[in-house]
Amino acid sequence: LRPSRVHNSEENTMRALTLKDILNGTFSYKTFFPNWISGQEYLHQSADNNIVLYNIETGQSYTILSNRTMKSVNASNYGLSPDRQFVYLESDYSKLWRYSYTATYYIYDLSNGEFVRGNELPRPIQYLCWSPVGSKLAYVYQNNIYLKQRPGDPPFQITFNGRENKIFNGIPDWVYEEEMLATKYALWWSPNGKFLAYAEFNDTDIPVIAYSYYGDEQYPRTINIPYPKAGAKNPVVRIFIIDTTYPAYVGPQEVPVPAMIASSDYYFSWLTWVTDERVCLQWLKRVQNVSVLSICDFREDWQTWDCPKTQEHIEESRTGWAGGFFVSTPVFSYDAISYYKIFSDKDGYKHIHYIKDTVENAIQITSGKWEAINIFRVTQDSLFYSSNEFEEYPGRRNIYRISIGSYPPSKKCVTCHLRKERCQYYTASFSDYAKYYALVCYGPGIPISTLHDGRTDQEIKILEENKELENALKNIQLPKEEIKKLEVDEITLWYKMILPPQFDRSKKYPLLIQVYGGPCSQSVRSVFAVNWISYLASKEGMVIALVDGRGTAFQGDKLLYAVYRKLGVYEVEDQITAVRKFIEMGFIDEKRIAIWGWSYGGYVSSLALASGTGLFKCGIAVAPVSSWEYYASVYTERFMGLPTKDDNLEHYKNSTVMARAEYFRNVDYLLIHGTADDNVHFQNSAQIAKALVNAQVDFQAMWYSDQNHGLSGLSTNHLYTHMTHFLKQCFSLSD
């Protein structure tokens, strides 16, 4: 729980947060996610880096891998084979993009306590995983896929056409990694390890983004990434499946694409194995309002995969794009043909549906003016999911269980009343057959992770309660936080306000708006955080507000799809509307209002500053998008359509930051970007700067050499220190 407020007699011993506290991560919290290996066992890395096996039923634990072994190869990660014979140890981690990295892998034999010698794995490896049963290995090296029947065996090469920046096998290219799969891998074992499915991405015709990486050499390096911007040529994707028992027998077999998808540009969106001989693929038209789920079966006689039209399920949106941020994935039931899936109901709220034959005949499982967010697990008799139903707060997450074995199905909230004040935002992790599960509570109080019985929901033990953090916060004057809503013109604007510790409604405070505002995002969440804005409220006496306007998620399609094909309009309007309402509350100094945001938030903050309202004195944009023509095709076109004359080029042109250069004249603007941003290219800020210079508008700027979209490491400290100075100067606060 948040430490309770102390009375004046003790207030002298309390101190405000400092910027140093934030930059040092003094008040960071821990979570505990068990690495499940069976219904009742999990692995966990202990504080002293031993890998320990816990048996919930016996209460016993023992070390299966010592820290000495881990240290011998500088391992930072591990993975136990399902037959418990081997562990892979991962070292030499080298980050690539958001999810991808390369590493060196060593295989340790637990039976004899030695590393496997002979036929060692090549280095560096792009992805490696065990089969779901036994100890087969699949890995990707130099964009090709390899298979080992046993760790000590020589590898079998599955693909041969892999080429850097051209053909990717078993791993996604840049745009599929960031905007479609959200993983570092693009290969999937069948449940018993008989088959291996994989994607091949052909980037041959994709235009390349090139930027300088300055490094320490005499000449900078040029980084080249095939990166399709809006309207550009996209990757060509194909899905193959190979029999891993006899991989050389027939080789990889291509899975056919549904005809209605293949007729124009399309994407592959996900693959879900149902059984060893049934697989479900999801495809999406390039214009992302039509998605097709295709269930395919293995034909033993032909050794091919058959995807009958009768097993194609179409999901279409008439008011926006298909799905939320991504199209949801199915969770199959035990009959291996019917499944549960989240999609919009007739009232425009995302809910769980049960599909047995056709989508038209789907049975709606949840309903109401709230949204189902994730299906965690389906067992023979229960379905576990999360939603924001409880007490009508869209920024909460509770875990529910629906009994599907009985009729009518009964619903129980597993988490709603557990630690009601402390915990309102949960996720969960389930063991095999949901015999046990871990709950991870993210707030609003201090996070806590607990272990529960999957049948009774009884709490078995606390896995992590962040006692040290609780003690460390005892003498800190934390800001107050409140989550409320504004009703404006039939739109509900939820906001979070962070108030200085000694907040007094009769006084006037500077206001900082923190904005993200991207489609299907949510900023107003009941989670714990001690971060930069906590410091600004605690030490510098600012009021900070976050507002979820049109385009944001989990409040129905009307709000979500309001921004369809017109990004940069309503998101900005709603921030401005909220600021006006905050001023009406009487405690905001209207001469000291600022806005800041990062990425999409940098775009919104820039447009808000250039809105000509006179509301904002100053603002900051970190790594902003400045024109949707500069951003990735998969993301941009989902919400904006194509930048062509016969589609939506006009709004692409109207929604740029550059077009509003003149309007920055009356605000103080700080523009910040990393020069090695692979995601929102430095080009975006370069163009803003050019437009401001051409308009003879003064502004401040900071670049971070060789830094990507995250501005990590020492850059983080410099960034927040720099932004703090800028805001304090803007608000006339003494340094």
Partner: nanobody
């Protein structure tokens, strides 16, 4: 620390059967998953079969369909039923937790010899 005692080994002809037993000095149900391992002369120790406390079983490819592992919790015993034995099954057989504990010790094992 639970002490483990293997028994039931012996000399058997190719195609024959043996049943190995492993008795735990502590309560076996208080131990998680149990496994059988073997070490042939000149080779490294390798895993043969495993059974979880819930009764789920798993086998090495080399013994799949020929060996079966089962447990009798009240008797604190884990068994390995070995059928259709082959000369290449000749080894010292050990039982231990599955996977074995880094800091645990191995028992004496029981010798299985399969003659052709």
């Amino acid at each position: 620390q639970v002490q483990l005692q293997e028994s039931g080994g012996g000399l058997v002809q190719s195609g024959g059967s043996l049943r190995l037993s492993c008795v735990a000095s502590g309560s076996i149900s208080s131990i998680n998953a149990m496994g059988w391992y073997r070490q042939a002369p000149g080779n490294k120790r390798e895993w043969v079969a495993g059974i979880t406390s819930g009764g789920s079983t798993n086998y090495a490819d080399a013994v799949l369909g020929r060996f079966s592992i089962f447990r009798d919790n009240p008797k604190n015993t884990v068994y390995l039923q070995m059928n259709s034995l082959k000369p290449e099954d000749t080894a010292v057989y050990y039982c231990n937790t599955w996977p074995p504990s880094t800091f645990g010790s191995w028992g004496q094992g029981t010798q299985v010899t399969v003659s052709s």
